[in-house]
Interface confidence: medium
């Protein structure tokens, strides 16, 4: 996973970027500051949400891999039902209210890829503006 740029002390912080924990992120970058939290730079403002894990029923041996947030079934231990639905995204939660847009500037690097279930970073800017950050994120 790509890291944000280290923020120089004497560098300008323009509206095209977000700074979190000393790292600079470009407009529409998506990153995980910690395993169970996901953030996006939305026009100069950092918006974060908790990662919501799918239930791991019918999988008694589910474990959380190191550095990850959600438990996964060990290979081959899923029930037939689980195998049929492995990799299928569950229903999305309700979209949160659209927040006010801040300024944007031209995107820098491509956004950091999201976890499975999250949309990847959009392409070059153009009307309409970017959607607001959803209420929940599935892993």
């Amino acid at each position: 996973q790509e890291e944000g740029q280290v923020e120089g002390q004497d560098e300008d912080i323009p509206p095209i970027t977000c700074v979190q924990n000393g790292l600079r992120y470009h407009d529409r970058d998506v990153w995980k500051p910690e395993p169970c939290r996901i953030c996006v730079c939305d026009n100069g403002k950092v918006l974060c949400d908790d990662v919501i894990c799918d239930e791991t029923k019918n999988c008694p041996g589910a474990e959380v891999p190191e550095g990850e947030c959600c438990p996964v079934c060990p290979d081959g231990s899923e029930s037939p039902t689980d195998q049929e639905t492995t990799g299928v995204e569950g229903p999305k939660g309700d979209t949160g209210p659209r927040g006010p847009r801040g300024p944007a500037g031209p995107p820098g690097r491509d956004g950091i890829p999201g976890q499975p279930g999250l949309p990847g970073p959009p392409g070059p800017p153009g009307p309409p503006g970017p959607p607001g950050l959803g209420g929940n994120f599935a892993p």
Epitope: D12, P14, P15, I16, N43, G44, K45, P100, R101, G102, P103, A104, G105, P106, P125, P127, P128, G129
Partner: antibody
Framework: EVQLQQSGAELARPGGSVKLSCKAS????????MQWLRQSPGRGLEWIGV????????RYTQKFQGKATLTADKSSSTAYMQLSSLASEDSAVYYC????????????WGQGTTVTVSS | DIQLTQSPKSMSMSVGERVTLSCKAS??????VSWYQQRPEQSPKLLIY???NRCTGVPDRFTGSGSGTDFTLTISSVQAEDLADYHC?????????FGAGTKLEIK
């Protein structure tokens, strides 16, 4: 109709300070960043900084850090720029301009405020 | 900082003539260039954004083109009301920077 109405001309002494205002109307003041720029014959258009009225987040270009202070009053939909330690080279026309993030442009500009620094 | 160089500094044209203004960036700025028209004693007015997108209400005789480091504003048939300074500006990186402008005079 979007409008940005700036305060009148200012005459200041070297070392003094002035506070310029930019009253916004016709749009949601707290949802758009406000850019500040200046224009003088010798230097053309220069970008000073930007403020997000929704939370007061202000950001400056390095040249104007310590020189300009940006604030905003949500109740009156007015953005302010205070300029301190004025010198003759700060004589210029100062503009506020709305930043339209959709297209990455300054789409509406105030009419400008002329600041003259003279002893 | 990114430098923008505009040429010519000034030009005098007759009504109906075709005008071409140039703006060169010191480094690649993609298509993140805007053009502004500033009539005498007025504030800048946005004409073109994203190098080639005409702003709402701007006559179609104004056309922007270019990418990377070379940009052009063309007025296909200049009118008397086009008397103004024309500035290019880049928003590819901060600080935002602008060219020194081209003064268009009408004969």
């Amino acid at each position: 109709e979007v409008q940005l109405q700036q305060s009148g001309a200012e005459l200041a002494r070297p070392g003094g300070s002035v506070k310029l205002s930019c009253k916004a109307s016709g749009y949601s003041f707290t949802a758009y960043w406000m850019q500040w720029l200046r224009q003088s014959p010798g230097r053309g258009l220069e970008w000073i900084g930007v403020i997000y009225p929704g939370d007061g987040d202000a950001r400056y270009t390095q040249k104007f850090q310590g020189k300009a202070t940006l604030t905003a009053d949500k109740s009156s939909s007015t953005a302010y720029m205070q300029l301190s330690s004025l010198a003759s080279e700060d004589s210029a026309v100062y503009y506020c301009a709305r930043w339209f993030h959709h297209d990455y442009v300054m789409d509406y500009w105030g009419q400008g405020t002329t600041v003259t620094v003279s002893s | 900082d990114i430098q923008l160089t505009q040429s010519p500094k000034s030009m005098s044209m007759s009504v109906g003539e075709r005008v071409t203004l140039s703006c060169k960036a010191s480094e690649n700025v993609g298509t993140y260039v805007s053009w502004y028209q500033q009539r005498p004693e007025q504030s800048p007015k946005l004409l073109i954004y994203g190098a080639s997108n005409r702003c709402t209400g701007v006559p179609d005789r104004f056309t922007g083109s270019g990418s990377g480091t070379d940009f052009t504003l063309t007025i296909s048939s200049v009118q008397a009301e086009d008397l103004a300074d024309y500035h290019c500006g880049q928003i590819y990186n901060y600080p935002l920077t602008f060219g020194a402008g081209t003064k268009l005079e009408i004969k």
